[in-house]
């Protein structure tokens, strides 16, 4: 299989393009979070359903050649590598929690009387650190809905409420998958709160909204993309475990024009250490909290994973030998808070902030729509991918 870094970048960008078709405003999701949920489904699917999901984890080239003729045994071994990679990644991520509030949580909510393969439930726990919660969909669908919502709320410090709206769960529901990613990080260098000022954020050339604009002047990884007329900036989080990358077009309405010129491969290349260089940057970044939830069945089906969400095509025989099981609901929700908080600069360094544009300083003024993603540097996995276009 491809590395989690490559897979999450590819899925992140492909999913972004899919979500963009029906979303004008902010888009925000966790590619790696969604991948863990896909992995959990893959674990329980067989046949064509599994093959469709498996393709997410392989590059086009690999899929088209050797894998098509792969024997069943080889496919199973490949699949195991996928799950082992997630096990390793989730273990690594859990070690970061002293410095960050970072939770990647998967939970299956299963009809309490429905029969599941014991082996599947054991594996889900082993590889995905996920548990299965029994709920009474049959006799208490709405109560079950509320139970799931309050669990989500508790896992996100009350930031994500009513993930499942009224009527979204019925008595015929057998299985609900919830993937949730919550992140509140500390920058490697804090933004001084006293430098945060109210400023206009231009959604387009004629419409603006007020934002709290954080500012700092420091050395950052930077690259200028001449053909795209855009800048990329890397902002490290504490201990450099994670970084946020901002892709800011020069023009207010430049983002739409350049999206088609971006590919997952280019994103990886542009943000690689060899491509970016340390530059002094005057950075202006809005303080923002984004929370987004997506019902992923239709979106993933549009991306070629339709069988898993089709009552008539789904093969979940690795999860249950009872017929008719499929993921009726696959909800992904993510939350990130971008605030001033970070490691306080030691007084001795005495970095003062000047608003004037000093010679040799790059200006990265995020006061119009930009793309951003948060990367786990050790695995190169994309924790979050988003478009900030509307405060």
């Amino acid at each position: 299989m491809d590395s989690l870094g490559a897979v999450s970048t590819r899925l992140g960008f492909d999913l972004f393009k899919e979500l963009k078709k029906t979303n004008d405003g902010n888009i925000f999701f966790s590619p790696v979070g969604i991948l863990t949920a896909i992995g959990m489904v893959l674990l329980g699917t067989r046949g064509a359903t599994a093959s469709q999901l498996e393709e997410v984890f392989h590059s086009e080239k690999e899929t088209k050649s050797s894998r098509i003729k792969a024997e069943e045994k080889e496919v199973i071994e490949n699949t195991e590598a996928v799950h082992q990679q997630f096990q390793k990644f989730l273990t690594e991520i859990s070690k970061l929690t002293n410095d960050y509030e970072l939770n990647i949580t998967n939970r299956l909510f299963g009809e309490k009387t429905y029969l599941f393969l014991q082996k599947y439930l054991d594996y889900v726990e082993k590889y995905y650190h996920a548990s299965l919660e029994p709920v009474d969909f049959v006799n208490a669908a709405d109560e079950s809905r509320k139970k799931i919502n309050s669990w989500v709320e508790s896992k996100t410090n009350e930031k994500i409420k009513d993930l499942f709206p009224d009527g979204s769960i019925s008595s015929s529901t057998k299985l609900v998958l919830v993937n949730m990613v919550y992140f509140k990080g500390q920058w490697d260098r804090e933004f001084k709160k006293e430098n945060t000022k109210e400023e206009k954020f231009w959604m387009n050339k004629s419409t603006s909204k007020s934002v709290q604009m954080m500012t700092q002047s420091h050395s950052f990884s930077f690259t200028f993309l001449e053909d795209l007329q855009a800048k990329i900036l890397g902002i490290p989080y504490k201990n450099n475990d994670l970084s946020m990358f901002v892709l800011l077009p020069n023009d207010i309405d430049g983002l739409e024009k350049i999206i088609d010129k971006i590919s997952p491969e280019k994103l990886v290349e542009w943000t690689s250490p060899g491509h970016m260089e340390e530059r002094k940057v005057n950075l202006h970044l809005p303080r923002f909290e984004v929370e987004d939830g997506y019902d992923l069945e239709a979106v993933l089906a549009a991306m070629g994973m339709g069988d898993a969400f089709s009552e008539h095509k789904a093969d979940y025989s690795g999860m249950s030998s009872g017929s008719g099981l499929y993921a009726q609901k696959f909800l992904h929700s993510s939350f990130v808070a971008v605030t001033e908080e970070g490691t306080e600069a030691a007084a001795a360094t005495g970095i003062g902030f000047t608003v004037t544009s000093a010679p040799g300083h790059e200006n990265v003024h995020c006061n119009h729509p930009f793309l951003f993603f948060i990367r786990h540097n050790e695995s190169n996995s994309i924790l979050f991918f988003g478009r900030f276009s509307s405060p």
Partner: antibody, heavy 132, light 107 residues
């Protein structure tokens, strides 16, 4: 087709040991938990011991705890019951039985071997006689 | 530990007749995890019913199970010659205990 072929029974003196085997074929052995169930001559059925699909979890009836050990070798598609310190009351026909691979969420969380799982296929049985 | 009491001990009937077998638990069988097995002389038991009322694969529809809580019933709507055997109920929801059996014999 699905088969559970048993071996290892025989006559043994009280205090002696015996190892029963059960060779499985016709299904994916490591998808299933397995159990041993016994039946004393002319009597009813008694669950003896169970093991989950990967051997990570085992359970025993109070009457055999500390004397019997259940194990499995998934590579060989085989189930075993090591019986030590045998007593006259252990005399019975011993069956290996495949547990249903399915469990409800509720019973799965109880984490007890064999709980929530019926026995959908049985071996032909092997007789163990403990007599002096 | 749950004790299962089956009644009657023996049921003498003719082919074509209806057989009603009872199984009473000393405490509630959790989740209706009650199974019924059939055993003929010299043969291992065969699963008939699981979950109190679901027929196992290949079991004819003349066999049906019902009940919940502490009272369960196995019904054979029309006895066939091959149905004469001993029937056991089993609580597999907590204690994995079996009842003592009901023998259905030819009258």
């Amino acid at each position: 087709q699905m088969q559970l072929v048993q071996s290892g029974g025989g006559v043994v003196r009280p205090g002696g040991s015996l190892r029963l085997s059960c060779a499985a074929s016709g299904f994916t052995f490591d998808d299933y938990g397995m159990s041993w169930v016994r039946q004393a001559p002319g009597k009813g059925l008694e669950w003896v011991s169970g093991i989950n699909w990967n051997g990570g979890s085992t359970g025993y009836a109070d009457s055999v705890k500390g004397r019997f050990t259940i194990s499995r070798d998934n590579a060989k598609n085989s189930l075993y019951l090591q019986m030590n310190s045998l007593r006259a009351e252990d005399t019975a026909l011993y069956y290996c039985a495949r547990e249903s691979s399915m469990t409800t969420v509720t019973t799965y969380l109880l984490r007890e071997v064999g709980v929530g799982l019926d026995f959908d296929y049985w071996g032909q049985g092997t007789l163990v006689t403990v007599s002096s | 530990e749950t004790t299962l009491t089956q009644s009657p001990g023996t049921l003498s009937l003719s082919p074509g007749e209806r057989a009603t077998l009872s199984c009473r638990a000393s405490q509630t069988v959790s989740g209706s995890y009650l199974a019924w097995y059939q055993q003929k002389p010299g043969q291992p038991p065969r699963l008939l019913i699981y979950g109190a009322s679901s027929r196992a694969t290949g079991i004819p529809d003349r066999f049906s199970g019902s009940g919940s809580g502490t009272d369960f019933t196995l019904t054979i709507s029309r006895l066939e010659p091959e149905d004469f055997a001993v029937y056991y109920c089993q609580d597999y929801g907590s204690s994995r205990t079996f009842g003592q059996g009901t023998k259905v014999e030819l009258k």
